[in-house]
Amino acid sequence: SETTTGTSSNSSQSTSNSGLAPNPTNATTK
């Protein structure tokens, strides 16, 4: 199996969950 490493350049050491809705629901069907 293969192993790869990724390093983020973002300086914060606490992952920001702020890009995602806190209690998401499914998108409505149109």
Partner: antibody, heavy 115, light 112 residues
Amino acid sequence: EVKFEESGGGLVQPGGSIKLSCAASGVTFSEAWMDWVRQSPEKGLEWVAEIRDKTKNYVTYYAESVKGRFTISRDDSKGRVYLQMNNLRTEDTGIYYCTGAMDYWGQGTSVTVSS
Amino acid sequence: DIVMTQTPLSLSVTIGQPASISCKSSQSLLYSNGKTYLNWLQQRPGQSPKRLIYQVSKLDPGIPDRFSGSGSETDFTLKISRVEAEDLGIYYCMQGSSLPWTFGGGTKLEIK
């Protein structure tokens, strides 16, 4: 330094199984919502699954295309998130990234489903 | 699913000049808490994606302020005030308002 290290990718036959692992360091892992996102030339970036933290009761979410076949899990004591992939299809081929809620990303591990 | 449509597919920009990328969502991304979960990601050649902006206009730590995001509801824009050589790559918008999370098809930024 924040580092996400993925492992477990490889070549698997259709109908087979594989388990991906992602080890996080330099980040408060227990508070992170963890996602798996895959990338292929055909479909571009495609969200696969997410597991939230203890405060959200480790709730999980899945893309419709993998529901019932893939299982996301985490071990906060080890700072790891896993993706168990069963009944694999050729369309599951791609590079699989683990990401902390789209904030930090690993470099990806390649999964090829082919006979 | 919410469909994210980006334009243009590619653009070629001279270093020092501005660049603009549009992203349109098939449904409003305004969440019930008043926030809009629209993210912009950058993927340099041979690298993994990196988030630049979240909640439409908030820059992630360490991201140069030449990047800016704007928009609301269904129409969003990423702007680079002065393109630098390191900005080449593919830019994606991504919505985190409704499941499943979905990405735009990407805009390839090339340097003239």
